[in-house]
């Protein structure tokens, strides 16, 4: 009696269980009663990443330098090429089909987490006692200068965008 289901890494065709082609290979011809499944390795710049019965291999992804993309990991016959973005840019998605310039944190905000090839800069507001006077993708909020430790007094209060201004203490004559 012909099978209705096949084992793992097999497929049913013409009432027969044939072996799937292994990753990195494509199907040339199905098995018969007398012959095994015929598979061929994928060509240069092609891949198949699963046990399969595909008659065509997939093309490796192209990391388009015009979009700021570069190869992070070269593809093999069993894996696709992995793209990433050039320095200062990050991928728009997991598939990394295009890039976006890293966000800068505006004055009053500091960098909580520096951007990577796949994630954007994370900014945070500078809390009381801290400031940032620049727009930057790297700078954290800086603590206000401690006037006391310099034997000075606060002449002008700090804000989230400016440091305190220290000055000499009034001397009592």
């Amino acid at each position: 009696e012909p099978p209705t289901a096949c084992r793992e890494k097999q497929y049913l065709i013409n009432s027969q269980c044939c072996s799937l082609c292994q990753p990195g290979q494509k199907l040339v011809s199905d098995c018969t009663e007398f012959t095994e499944t015929e598979c061929l390795p994928c060509g240069e710049s092609e891949f198949l990443d699963t046990w399969n019965r595909e008659t065509h291999c997939h093309q490796h992804k192209y990391c388009d330098p015009n979009l700021g993309l570069r190869v992070q990991q070269k593809g093999t016959s069993e894996t696709d090429t992995i793209c990433t973005c050039e320095e200062g840019w990050h991928c728009t998605s997991e598939a990394c089909e295009s890039c976006v310039l890293h966000r800068s944190c505006s004055p009053g905000f500091g960098v909580k987490q520096i951007a990577t090839g796949v994630s954007d800069t994370i900014c945070e507001p500078c809390p009381v006692g801290f400031f940032s006077n620049v727009s930057s993708a790297f700078e954290k909020c800086h603590p206000w200068t401690s006037c006391e430790t310099k034997d000075l007094v606060v002449q002008q209060a700090g804000t989230n965008k400016t440091d305190v201004v220290c000055g000499p203490q009034d001397r009592l004559r």
Partner: antibody, heavy 117, light 108 residues
Framework: QSVEESGGRLVTPGTPLTLTCTVS????????IHWVRQAPGKGLEYIGI?????NIVYATWALGRFTISKTSTTVDLKITSPTTEDTATYFC??????????????WGPGTLVTVSS | DVVMTQTPASVSEPVGGTVTMKCQAS??????LAWYQQKPGRPPKLLIY???TLASGVSSRFSGSGSGTEFTLTISDLECADAATYYC??????????FGGGTEVVVK
């Protein structure tokens, strides 16, 4: 598919004003929406964007002056404390994709905001 | 921030002529650049995106080129209907989607 701005009117300086961009024929979960303005007789000025995922980014000059938010079919632009310099026609535009790095292929006719005392 | 500089501010050419305008970015934006046409009282219309890709329904008389920091928009076989102001825009994403100052095209 269309986008249309509304809410533009004459306001006095300091009076908050909310503009609305109403979209139809496409989903805001698939496209980014940009806000752009144009002062009378001047060029285009980029304000900010809300992408499909709800991430909001403002042009540096616009930080603190505007607030962008969205519902399922509308995107709002709030001018927090208008000054006479904010007198302009405000446009919303649909991005070609869901991301912030996309050009705008669909624009509304614009809504005029006049700030005057 | 990315600053976009357009030249010339204005250009005048006869019908049938060719107009070329330039757009310079203050930093490398690869090919993340769009061109728009705007006529008085109308919203901008997308002509070209990704520096050289023609937007849907746009005449092939419009062409864009360049990458990095230098970009060009060319209008060939100029028609009266091409009289408008043309803007370039960085589409590098985030807060970097700045516009250039515009180039006015006058058709004689």
């Amino acid at each position: 598919q269309s986008v249309e701005e509304s809410g533009g009117r004459l306001v006095t300086p300091g009076t908050p004003l909310t503009l609305t961009c109403t979209v139809s024929g496409f989903s805001l979960s698939a496209y980014a929406i940009h806000w752009v303005r144009q002062a009378p007789g001047k060029g285009l000025e980029y304000i900010g964007i809300i992408d499909a995922g709800g991430n909001i980014v403002y042009a540096t000059w616009a930080l603190g002056r505007f607030t962008i938010s969205k519902t399922s079919t509308t995107v709002d632009l709030k001018i927090t404390s208008p000054t006479t310099e904010d007198t302009a026609t405000y446009f919303c535009g649909r991005g070609l994709s869901s991301y912030s790095n996309s050009a705008m292929d669909l624009w509304g006719p614009g809504t005029l905001v006049t700030v005057s005392s | 921030d990315v600053v976009m500089t357009q030249t010339p501010a204005s250009v005048s050419e006869p019908v049938g002529g060719t107009v070329t305008m330039k757009c310079q970015a203050s930093q490398n934006i690869y090919t993340y650049l769009a061109w728009y046409q705007q006529k008085p009282g109308r919203p901008p219309k997308l002509l070209i995106y990704q520096a050289s890709t023609l937007a849907s329904g746009v005449s092939s008389r419009f062409s864009g080129s360049g990458s990095g920091t230098e970009f060009t928009l060319t209008i060939s076989d100029l028609e009266c209907a091409d009289a408008a102001t043309y803007y370039c825009q960085s589409t590098a994403g985030n807060a970097y989607n700045a516009f250039g100052g515009g180039t006015e095209v006058v058709v004689k």
